[in-house]
């Protein structure tokens, strides 16, 4: 049994890091493998992650972490029974993938303005809370070419757009994702999308 693709990990910089790797053949990850991880810190304890299958030869493990900060560094040991298959390390702050924003809502009752709001996925005491920027994707269900991205570079989790910038009388969907420049993160996954029917009064022409 050998590791074909070494584990690569990303952290949500809150409580979970996800590591993925591939074996050289079909593997029952949860029964045959264990990923041991330990913070390189005084008094830290070793933890064991039981991986799940991710395709025939692929495995994924969700590592639970407390109080994640930029100085943290973890040792990782991948075991198959008594055999050490791979040894590595992981610094969560250098491989951050933020949590996806939630609770995306479209408010259509503001005069001819669409107000999109969503929730910051981090608590106020997490460093990322004040450092997320967002991308909002809006698209038409009827017209695949009607697809747009709005970059939200301010901290408030909201976006206002004129309803007239979208076509009237058709349905649209929106979703939002986040990233943080300070840790050079990847983009988060997209939030679940939300749907609304866009209708507004055409301006009266003289």
């Amino acid at each position: 049994m050998k590791v074909l693709q070494e584990p690569t990990c990303v952290s949500d910089y809150m409580s979970i890091s996800t590591c993925e790797w591939k074996m050289n053949g079909p593997t029952n990850c949860s029964t045959e493998l264990r990923l041991l991880y330990q913070l390189v810190f005084l008094l830290s304890e070793a933890h064991t992650c039981i991986p799940e299958n991710n395709g025939g030869a692929g495995c994924v493990c969700h590592l639970l972490m407390d109080d994640v900060v930029s100085a943290d560094n973890y040792t990782l040991d991948l075991w198959a029974g008594q055999q050490l298959l791979w040894k590595g390390s992981f610094k969560p702050s250098e491989h951050v993938k933020p949590r996806a924003p939630g609770n995306l809502t479209v408010h259509t009752n503001v005069s001819d303005t669409l107000l999109l709001t969503w929730s910051n996925p981090y608590p106020p005491d997490n460093y990322l809370y004040n450092h997320l920027t967002y991308a909002v994707n809006i698209w038409s269900e009827n017209d695949p070419a009607d697809f747009r991205i709005y970059n939200v570079t301010y901290l408030e989790p909201s976006l206002r757009i004129a309803a007239s910038t979208l076509k009237s009388g058709i349905s649209y969907r929106a979703r939002v994702r986040a990233w943080a420049q300070c840790y050079n993160t990847t983009w988060s996954e997209w939030s679940p999308s939300t749907k609304w029917h866009n209708s507004y009064r055409e301006p009266f022409e003289q």
Partner: antibody, heavy 116, light 111 residues
């Protein structure tokens, strides 16, 4: 919000021991290390040791090795610092502080006076 | 005895800028991150800066931190009378055993 509530002031005789408590609330107790530091009157801060509330293991500054013991009670989310063989130089305000590499939150402090 | 050295005192007028230095060595500041604490008269210390330059939520951006080699600096701009306090730097040292030294402390007086 996070609160670290420390026990009240103590007056002790030289050679005695003192046990200071620090009750934590507003966060997951076993997820954060706890430090202890002290400050003699008009002096700076001095680090004493750290405890991992999850497993209960502790590590102490070399200066206090053999005289200090840090423990925890997960059922009450409380950490304790006991200092033995007290001398007058141990007169200080003793603080618990939550954190790992730095101290996010501090208790208000407990004044321990050692006097004959 | 602290291994992190700070000036005993600094002073400046309201609205001015002041800097406080913290000098250490290769086994502590040089190899770790620096934090800064503010201790107002008669109160417990409060975290002001961590990770060399990050502010906890609620700390105004008048406070900033930096690190270079084995030294660190706390800068306070737009000084206010409420900033009058003692400021301590802190870090950790893993040279022999893990320890968390603090700086000697700097008393800031707002004139």
């Amino acid at each position: 919000q996070v609160q670290l509530v420390q026990s009240g002031a103590e007056v002790k005789k030289p050679g005695a021991s003192v046990k200071v408590s620090c009750k934590a609330s507003g966060y997951a107790f076993t997820s954060y290390y706890m430090h202890w530091a002290r400050q003699a009157p008009g002096q700076g801060l001095e680090w004493m040791g750290i405890i991992n509330p999850s497993g209960g293991s502790a590590s102490y500054a070399q200066k206090f090795q053999g005289r200090v013991t840090m423990t925890r009670d997960t059922s009450t989310s409380t950490v304790y610092m006991e200092l033995s063989s007290l001398r007058s130089e141990d007169t200080a305000v003793y603080y618990c502080a939550r954190g790992k590499y730095w101290m996010y939150d501090w208790g208000k402090g407990t004044l321990v006076t050692v006097s004959s | 005895q602290s291994v992190l050295t700070q000036p005993p005192s600094v002073s400046a007028a309201p609205g001015q800028k002041v800097t406080i230095s913290c000098s250490g060595g290769s086994s502590n500041i040089g190899n770790s991150y620096v934090s800064w604490y503010q201790q107002l008269p008669g109160t417990a210390p409060k975290l002001l800066i961590y990770d060399n330059n990050k502010r906890p939520s609620g700390i105004p951006d008048r406070f900033s931190g930096s690190k270079s080699g084995t030294s660190a600096t706390l800068a306070i701009t737009g000084l206010q009378t409420g900033d009058e306090a003692v400021y301590f730097c802190g870090t950790w040292d893993t040279s022999t055993v893990w320890e968390w030294p603090f700086g000697t402390g700097t008393k800031l007086t707002v004139l």
